[in-house]
Interface confidence: medium
Amino acid sequence: HPIPDSSPLLQFGGQVRQRYLYTDDAQQTEAHLEIREDGTVGGAADQSPESLLQLKALKPGVIQILGVKTSRFLCQRPDGALYGSLHFDPEACSFRELLLEDGYNVYQSEAHGLPLHLPGNKSPHRDPAPRGPARFLPLPGLPPALPEPPGILAPQPPDVGSSDPLSMVGPSQGRSPSYAS
């Protein structure tokens, strides 16, 4: 048996786990949370390179979630919408990890308190959290073979040369998508 994620040793700063976050909630098709290269977040029926995640404790009970293949952080807008960002914004990209007795975990935005859900069939800006918190089962992935890439947490300068028609370049959050029409 691997050390369960409920181990108190895993709740303190610097602890790194590689996991697939699997959900089998009744209202959801069975899926693994996946952070794609272009910043979209979705669910994959099977484990995929994009669904292998690195969970790193920032402080007790609070983690950041990084897509191992895509080097994008899982982040959440105030309306509950999920996206993958090349930049780590502590407010948007920190999640409180709540451990359930059955081995499942619940994640919620530390800043907004909104529960983490895979994108459903409704646009998140209209229906950000229609259900209770989604339960995720952290399935073991490969142990990290290499240290984190240097500077992964260092914010990159915003893309000032881009006149992005989607207004996706934020002043302090890197490229987070704008859902406001």
Partner: antibody, heavy 117, light 106 residues
Framework: QVQLQQSGAELARPGASVKLSCKAS????????ISWVKQRTGQGLEWIGE????????YYNEKFKGKATLTADKSSSTAYMELRSLTSEDSAVYFC??????????WGQGTTLTVSS | QIVLTQSPALMSASPGERVTMTCSAG?????MYWYQQKPRSSPKPWIY???NLASGVPARFSGSGSGTSYSLTISSMEAEDAATYYC?????????FGGGTKVEIK
């Protein structure tokens, strides 16, 4: 401003290969994906595949595996698509497009490929 | 792969008329994206994340839907809106486009 400048029209023989280019400017090339989209005359749009220059990771539509190969040169901010074993079915306009958050937000002007003997 | 079916394939509308076209997905998708294309031109980004207008798109356009049913509406048709509109999804690989709805002006 963001621009995707594609190479000029190509005329090729059946069985030959051709390499189309897409030069990006006005944004950080490695922060976005470049997709390629096919459009035959009077037809709809078909996604071929996508490359992420930052990682060189590529994703293909199964239909085009073995037909198309996507590459990118970070130093020149240019994406390439090589099409091999050309047939008349490959005659089309090919667009490169920038990919961001699931959306194709900028498009090149298109390259017309004609395959004829 | 997820098949997107657009209807109607061709429609004609008078100036000022309300126009609605639909995009039906073979299985549920999270979001829909729309593009406008005119003859001999590249497609233009039109609507993203189901209901958000891309930069420069007139407010008379709107998008809605969820699950397997999505639509694009022009509240008051204008001559410049004559074009072909394509829907696109990426909830599942490969990314797929609908066959397009061609809108003509009467």
């Amino acid at each position: 401003q963001v621009q995707l400048q594609q190479s000029g029209a190509e005329l090729a023989r059946p069985g030959a290969s051709v390499k189309l280019s897409c030069k990006a400017s006005g944004y950080t090339f490695t922060n976005y994906g470049i997709s390629w989209v096919k459009q035959r005359t009077g037809q709809g749009l078909e996604w071929i595949g996508e490359i992420y220059p930052r990682s060189d990771n590529t994703y293909y539509n199964e239909k085009f595996k073995g037909k198309a190969t996507l590459t990118a040169d970070k130093s020149s901010s240019t994406a390439y698509m090589e099409l091999r074993s050309l047939t008349s079915e490959d005659s089309a306009v090919y667009f490169c497009t920038r990919s961001d958050y699931g959306f194709f937000d900028y498009w090149g002007q298109g390259t017309t490929l004609t395959v004829s003997s | 792969q997820i098949v997107l079916t657009q209807s109607p394939a061709l429609m004609s509308a008078s100036p000022g008329e309300r126009v609605t076209m639909t995009c039906s997905a073979g299985s549920s998708v999270s979001y829909m994206y729309w593009y406008q294309q005119k003859p001999r031109s590249s497609p233009k980004p039109w609507i993203y994340l189901t209901s958000n207008l891309a930069s420069g798109v007139p407010a008379r356009f709107s998008g809605s839907g969820s699950g397997t049913s999505y639509s694009l509406t022009i509240s008051s048709m204008e001559a410049e809106d004559a074009a072909t509109y394509y829907c696109q999804q990426w909830s599942s690989n490969p990314r797929t486009f609908g066959g397009g709805t061609k809108v003509e002006i009467k």
